[in-house]
């Protein structure tokens, strides 16, 4: 009997109660490998889950999350809510980014604004909860005495062609 069962292909199960050994999986069930003694119940994508791929006799349904949620865990076993830009998801729900931090995505955590002065630059555009600061030229470059003229091109040595 074991040998006969191993001949049952995916999409069927080995039915010991019938003379025809390999029986097709009943509706809403599947077997993804051959030689199965039972078919598995198809996953149902309900509530915050939506169907990404329908169940077939040989493969389980695949779920996704409805708008406003994103998948977590193996095979999208959980749906975690999205937050708005300018927020981060905590264990107690979506919270606004603290001053000095931002999040430009619907998931993830708030990150500190770039410290422009560490690169010797100045803040060109202030940061918000949703956007990082934009760094501009260094403060020295913006001082009244600084020339904004284009510096002269370096002189070429005779006999050298331009790079």
């Amino acid at each position: 009997l074991q040998d006969l069962c191993s001949n049952c292909p995916a999409g069927t199960f080995c039915d010991n109660n019938r003379s025809q050994i390999c029986s097709p999986c009943p509706p809403n069930s599947f077997s993804s490998a051959g030689g199965q003694r039972t078919c598995d119940i198809c996953r149902q994508c309900k509530g915050v889950f939506k169907t990404r791929k329908e169940c077939s006799s040989t493969s389980n349904a695949e779920c996704d999350c409805i708008s406003g949620y994103h998948c977590l865990g193996a095979e999208c076993s959980m749906c975690e809510q999205d937050c708005k830009q300018g927020q981060e998801l905590t264990k107690k729900g979506c919270k606004d980014c603290c001053f000095g931090t931002f999040n430009d995505q619907k998931r993830g955590i708030c990150r500190p604004w770039t410290n422009c002065s560490l690169d010797g630059k100045s803040v060109l555009v202030n940061g918000t909860k949703e956007r990082d600061v934009v760094c501009g030229p260094s403060p020295a470059d913006l001082s009244p005495g600084a020339s904004s003229a284009t510096p002269p091109a370096p002189a070429r040595e005779p006999g050298h062609s331009p790079q």
Epitope: L89, T90, K91, K92, I109
Partner: nanobody, 124 residues
């Protein structure tokens, strides 16, 4: 391979109790905080409780405070959730999760591994 396997779910009447277990393997259990979360059929993920690696710090969602107790037994590499005075709104799939550090937090998720879940149904 890091693995978390939940058990203990089932059907219980309102006011009843259940104890969920989560068997951990593939990592040093006492070195990491652990968390329980749940997902009801029509809702997104809801944090339930977190316990530190040492077991001395615990946090609970307001919705379960005073009714649920999280605990751990490092000799058995097992996390527990004792659920008392169960209500219909506690019906959900319960997942245990490993956090990335030993320190417990009631703010950030630091989860890097999830279990497959166990179903709790509270109904008369």
């Amino acid at each position: 391979e890091v693995q978390l396997v939940e058990s203990g779910g089932g059907l219980v009447q309102p006011g009843g109790s259940l104890r969920l277990s989560c068997a951990a393997s593939g990592f040093t259990f006492s070195s990491f905080a652990m968390t329980w979360v749940r997902q009801a059929p029509e809702k997104g993920l809801e944090w339930v409780s977190t316990i530190s690696g040492s077991g001395d710090t615990t946090y609970y969602a307001d919705s379960v405070k005073g009714r649920f107790t999280i605990s751990r037994d490092s000799s058995k590499n097992t996390l527990y959730l004792q659920m008392n005075s169960l209500r219909a709104e506690d019906s959900a799939v319960y997942f245990c999760a490993k956090e990335a550090t030993a320190m417990a937090s009631d703010y950030y998720y630091g989860v890097d591994v999830w279990g497959q879940g166990t179903t709790v149904t509270v109904s008369s």
